[in-house]
Interface confidence: medium
């Protein structure tokens, strides 16, 4: 899966734009597309054959400071009878996300981009069977 | 599209630091935690009972400019025999991510935060059965 590239070159030089001099850019922190009224069916996490719960991680020096991380409920998957089937595995799907890290420096807070690997939900997979020699 | 949520203005650091009224901050775009040797198992997308493919979306005015979005391969789920079971549904797990949007489009070093809803993978769920009256 294609993860966001380091970006400095991408941000510094779009097309024929001259490169940035100090690796910093100005960012307007008013968020566009905030929420958009999108309602994501909550019950996926419970109706899934690989159900999961959310843990909220909090970090006051990170933006966003609250991030919901998924945790698979079982090691196996839930079959049609509602029983755990250990011949299949519940695994977390991971996604790289960008966050901002605050580094206090007197009155002028400085911020930098940081990558985080986030578990976003679970899926049911066939285990890899290693054949004995 | 939802306009700036800046409205919920921000709190400032202890001391006598004046708050900013222009809603912009300087961000160092050299990424922390870049690559950390994290490897996201690619084969989940094929071994899952709700397999998916990735489409790469490209936008030169966005950072990251390339983002991989998942698309479920089937409407049903794949059973132990490798057949599609239409009594279950493959659904995309969605995740909010932060991106930087270049404004105005061009060589400007000004960006704004934008939230995007991204399909990151698929999971197999029991459909909701609506009882007839």
């Amino acid at each position: 899966r294609k993860n966001p590239k380091a970006g400095v070159p991408a941000l510094q030089k779009a097309g024929n734009c001259p490169p940035l001099e100090d690796n910093t850019v100005r960012v307007d922190i008013r968020i566009f597309n905030q929420n958009q009224g999108i309602s994501v069916p909550r019950e996926f996490q419970n109706r899934s054959s690989s159900p999961w719960d959310y843990n909220i991680t909090r970090d006051p020096h990170r933006f966003p400071s609250e991030i919901a991380e998924a945790q698979c409920r079982h090691s196996g998957c839930i079959n049609a009878q509602g029983q755990e089937d250990s011949t299949m595995n519940s695994v977390a799907i991971q996604q790289e996300i960008l966050v901002l890290r605050r580094e206090p420096q007197g009155c002028s807070n400085s911020f930098r981009l940081e990558k985080m690997l986030l578990k976003v939900g679970c899926t049911c997979v066939k285990p890899i069977v290693h054949q004995a020699a | 599209r939802k306009n700036p949520k800046a409205g919920v203005p921000a709190l400032q650091k202890a001391g006598n630091c004046p708050p900013l009224e222009d809603n912009t901050v300087r961000v160092d775009i050299r990424i922390f935690n870049q690559n950390q040797g994290i490897s996201v198992p690619r084969e989940f997308q094929n071994r899952s009972s709700s397999p998916w493919d990735y489409n790469i979306t490209r936008d030169p005015h966005r950072f990251p400019s390339e983002i991989a979005e998942a698309q479920c391969r089937h409407s049903g789920c794949i059973n132990a025999q490798g057949q599609e079971d239409s009594t279950m549904n493959s659904v995309a797990i969605q995740q909010e991510i932060l991106v930087l949007r270049r404004e105005p489009q061009g060589c400007s070093n000004s960006f704004r935060l934008e939230k995007m809803l991204l399909k990151v993978g698929c999971t197999c769920v029991k459909p909701i059965v609506h009882q007839a009256a």
């Epitope: 922190i29 905030q34 009224g37 909220i56 006051p60 | 939802k2 700036p4 949520k5 919920v8 203005p9």
Partner: antibody
């Protein structure tokens, strides 16, 4: 569970200033954004402005621009709203309210809106 | 600024009746509209966020709908404890604004 506790009632003379505080207990100030909303007697709610602690940025409604100053002190987990050049029509209950929306990410399920409000501070402006 | 106009200003309703309050925005605000309930001498409480999403702990008789410029708050089967003022609020663009409020009284 976060609670917002505001300072007590104030009686002020026209032309003076008032500074209302809003202390967040049970949570970190910088993890949220805050708005100040006022309500004159028998009237509706009016948004005055707000502050995003993490970034140290503020926004004010045009009506109050130049008279209102919103600040916060992360060391004491307290937000402040100061209103100057008071007049009789500033007599109102002043509320601080927390907005968690801005700070959440991860799952699109975690939306809150102005979910926690202070108890309100009555400011009376009278000569 | 975006002006929110609620109607009616006042409604006197008998218990178990259905109450409908509308909120019209002077320009499109997508789904960025929220509803609050305020009882006498109390702080406002969030009921519905983003037009239709119920806030946790809010009774299921409260529901919201709409997008763009026209929004509705519905109270199905009104209870005595629902006597309050109801306000719509937009967070689509600055400055944030509220509707003038609708007072619901129990007959």
């Amino acid at each position: 569970q976060v609670q917002l506790v505001q300072s007590g009632a104030e009686v002020k003379k026209p032309g003076s200033s008032v500074k209302v505080s809003c202390k967040a207990s049970g949570g970190t100030l910088s993890s949220y954004a805050f708005s100040w909303v006022r309500q004159a007697p028998g009237q509706g709610l009016e948004w005055m402005g707000g502050i995003i602690p993490f970034f140290g940025t503020v926004n004010y409604a045009q009506k109050f621009q130049g008279r209102v100053t919103i600040t916060a002190d992360e060391s004491t987990n307290t937000a402040y709203m100061e209103l100057s050049s008071l007049r009789s029509e500033d007599t109102a209950v002043y509320y601080c309210a927390r907005d968690r929306d801005y700070y959440g990410l991860g799952s699109p399920l975690h939306y809150y809106g102005l979910d926690v409000w202070g108890q309100g501070t009555t400011v009376t402006v009278s000569s | 600024e975006i002006v929110l106009t609620q109607s009616p200003d006042f409604q006197s309703v008998t218990p178990k009746e259905k109450v409908t309050i509308t909120c019209r925005a002077s320009q499109s605000i997508g789904s960025s509209l929220h509803w609050y309930q305020q009882k006498p001498d109390q702080s406002p409480k969030l009921l519905i966020k983003y037009a239709s999403q119920s806030f946790s702990g809010v009774p299921s008789r409260f529901s919201g709908s709409g997008s763009g410029t026209d929004f509705t708050l519905t109270i199905n089967s009104l209870e005595a404890e629902d006597a309050a003022a109801y306000y719509c609020h937009q967070s689509s663009s600055l400055p944030w604004t509220f509707g003038q409020g609708t007072k619901v009284e129990i007959k």
